[in-house]
C-alpha cells in the first residue's frame, strides 16, 4: 500500500502516524497548491488544523483582504492560515471549529461549534456555524446567522461605520458584533476598556482584550 504523501488537513496527518504537534505542509483540495499550517496533535485527541493564533502581539493583524485570503504570519507563532484554503477545505467535508481563549488572570475557556464552514470569496467568506457548546459563553460570540468577512480595504459589515477600520483586524463583523479575535493586541494592565481589542463578549464582556486565542478545525467524523 502506497504511503500518503499529500495531506488535506492535520487530521489526515495524524491518522498517517505523524502525531507530534508542529508545522506541516497541507495541500489545497483538488490542487497541488501547498500551504504551511500548525497542527495541534495534543488537544482533545489531536488532528487539529490551527487557522488562527494570537499570543503576544508580534504580528500585525490589521491586514488587507488579499492577505487574509492568502494567510500571513508564522505558523509557529501568531498567524492567520488563509480564508481561501479554509473555505475550500470546509466546503469539502463537515468540520468542527474549536476556539480556545486565555485571559490575563490565568483563566481558559473554549467554544466548540459542531459544524463550521466558510462560503467562497464570491460570498465574502461568510461564516456558517451551528451547535455551540463550551465554557466561553452559552451564546455565540460570533453573530448568528453568520456575517461576511470584512477587512480594512473591504467593508462588508452592517454598520454605518467601517468595523474593520474602527475595531482593527479582519473578522466576520456584523454591526460590529460580539467578537473580534483579530483585534488590536493589548498587553496586561492595558487590556481593559478597549473597544478595538481581542474580544469575546459572552466570556469576558465589553472592553476586555484577551491574552491568547486559537481557532482550530477538524473533520466532524475524526
Amino acid at each position: 500500500k502506497e504511503e500518503q504523501t499529500t495531506f488535506r488537513d492535520c487530521a489526515e496527518i495524524f491518522k498517517s502516524g505523524l502525531t507530534t504537534s508542529g508545522i506541516y505542509t497541507l495541500t489545497f483540495p483538488n490542487s497541488t497548491e501547498e500551504i504551511k499550517a500548525y497542527c495541534d496533535m495534543d488537544v482533545g485527541g489531536g488532528g487539529w488544523t490551527v487557522i488562527q493564533h494570537r499570543e503576544d502581539g508580534s504580528v500585525d493583524f490589521q491586514r488587507t483582504w488579499k492577505e487574509y485570503k492568502e494567510g500571513f504570519g508564522s505558523p509557529l507563532g501568531e498567524y492567520w492560515l488563509g480564508n481561501e484554503f479554509v473555505s475550500q477545505l470546509t466546503g469539502q467535508h463537515r468540520y468542527v471549529l474549536k476556539i480556545q481563549l486565555k485571559d490575563w488572570e490565568g483563566n481558559e475557556a473554549h467554544s466548540l461549534y459542531d459544524h463550521f464552514y466558510l462560503a467562497g470569496e464570491e460570498s465574502n467568506y461568510r461564516i456558517h456555524l451551528t451547535g455551540l457548546t463550551g465554557t466561553a459563553g452559552k451564546i455565540s460570540s460570533i453573530s448568528q446567522p453568520g456575517s461576511d468577512f470584512s477587512t480594512k480595504d473591504s467593508d462588508n459589515d452592517k454598520c454605518i461605520c467601517k468595523c474593520s477600520q474602527m475595531l482593527s483586524g479582519g473578522w466576520w463583523f456584523d454591526a460590529c458584533g460580539p467578537s473580534n479575535l483579530n483585534g488590536q493586541y493589548y498587553p496586561q494592565k492595558q487590556n481593559t476598556n478597549k473597544f478595538n481589542g481581542i474580544k469575546w463578549y459572552y466570556w469576558k464582556g465589553s472592553g476586555y482584550s484577551l491574552k491568547a486565542t486559537t481557532m482550530m478545525i477538524r473533520p466532524a467524523d475524526f
Epitope: 454598520c159 454605518i160 461605520c161 474602527m166 456584523d174 454591526a175 460590529c176 458584533g177 460580539p178 488590536q184 492595558q190 476598556n193 478597549k194 473597544f195 478595538n196 481589542g197 474580544k199 463578549y201 465589553s206 472592553g207
Partner: antibody
Framework: EVQLVESGGGVVQPGRSLRLSCAAS????????MHWVRQAPGKGLEWVSA????????YYADSVKGRFTISRDNAKNSLYLQMNSLRAEDTAVYYC????????????????WGQGTLVTVSS | DIVMTQSPLSLPVTPGEPASISCRSS???????????LDWYLQKPGQSPQLLIY???NRASGVPDRFSGSGSGTDFTLKISRVEAEDVGVYYC?????????FGGGTKVEIK
C-alpha cells in the same frame, strides 16, 4: 431600516411627572446602549442619560440626577425616561439615540436619532 | 466635565467654496487605544441631528466625501471641501471620552 420613535411629551406643570417612551425597530435592541439627549428651544444639544444594552448600567447628567430614571424593556424593544419633579429648565425636545457600536462601552457616537418629543414645563 | 468650544458661531458660505469649523476641548480626547473620542453631527433645519464623523476622522456611511474630520488631542477641525446648499444647518462636535458626553455650542452654516 433602523427606526426610533419617541412619544409621551406634552405640557406639564413644574413639580409634576412625565414618562417618555422610545420604540425601536430594525436592529437587535438588546445589543445596544441607548441614550436620551435634549435640546431646549433655540439652544444646543445636552446629553441627559444612558443605559447599557442589558439595562444593568445607567448614567445621568448632574442636572437630572435623582429626578430622572432611564430604563428599558428589551422584550418590547422600548426605552423609557421617567421624569419627576420637573422644572422649567427641563423644557426641551427629547431625543432618544442609539450607540454606534453594539456590545460595547462607548458613550457614543450616536448613529441613529429619533424625531424627538417636546416636553414643556410651565405653570 | 469636559468643555467643548466651537468656532465660529456662525459661518456664511458660498456654494462650491470650502468651509472649516473648529472645535477645542478642555482636555485631551486621545484614548489609550489611539483614537480621539470626538464626533461631529449636523442638524439640518427642522430635523434631528445626524452623525457625520466619528472618532475624529471616520466618515459615517452615506456621508459625502466632501466632509472630513481631522485633529488630535484638544484641537479638531471639520472641513467641507465644496459646500452644497443641502449642507446648511447647525454643526456640533461632541466628546465621548468621558461621562457625561458634552457637545460644543454649535456652528450655524448658512448660504450667503
Amino acid at each position: 431600516e433602523v427606526q426610533l420613535v419617541e412619544s409621551g411629551g406634552g405640557v406639564v406643570q413644574p413639580g409634576r411627572s412625565l414618562r417618555l417612551s422610545c420604540a425601536a425597530s430594525g436592529f437587535t435592541f438588546s445589543s445596544y446602549g441607548m441614550h436620551w439627549v435634549r435640546q431646549a428651544p433655540g439652544k444646543g444639544l445636552e446629553w441627559v442619560s444612558a443605559i447599557s444594552g442589558s439595562g444593568g448600567s445607567t448614567y445621568y447628567a448632574d442636572s437630572v440626577k435623582g429626578r430622572f430614571t432611564i430604563s428599558r424593556d428589551n422584550a418590547k424593544n422600548s426605552l423609557y425616561l421617567q421624569m419627576n419633579s420637573l422644572r422649567a429648565e427641563d423644557t426641551a425636545v427629547y431625543y432618544c439615540a442609539r450607540d454606534l457600536l453594539d456590545y460595547d462601552i462607548l458613550t457614543g457616537p450616536y448613529a441613529y436619532w429619533g424625531q424627538g418629543t417636546l416636553v414643556t414645563v410651565s405653570s | 466635565d469636559i468643555v467643548m468650544t466651537q468656532s465660529p458661531l456662525s459661518l456664511p458660505v458660498t456654494p462650491g467654496e470650502p468651509a472649516s469649523i473648529s472645535c477645542r476641548s478642555s482636555q485631551s480626547l486621545l484614548h489609550s487605544n489611539g483614537y480621539n473620542y470626538l464626533d461631529w453631527y449636523l442638524q439640518k433645519p427642522g430635523q434631528s441631528p445626524q452623525l457625520l464623523i466619528y472618532l475624529g476622522s471616520n466618515r459615517a456611511s452615506g456621508v459625502p466625501d466632501r466632509f472630513s474630520g481631522s485633529g488630535s488631542g484638544t484641537d479638531f477641525t471639520l472641513k467641507i471641501s465644496r459646500v452644497e446648499a443641502e449642507d446648511v444647518g447647525v454643526y456640533y462636535c461632541m466628546q465621548a471620552l468621558q461621562t457625561p458626553p458634552t457637545f460644543g455650542g454649535g456652528t450655524k452654516v448658512e448660504i450667503k
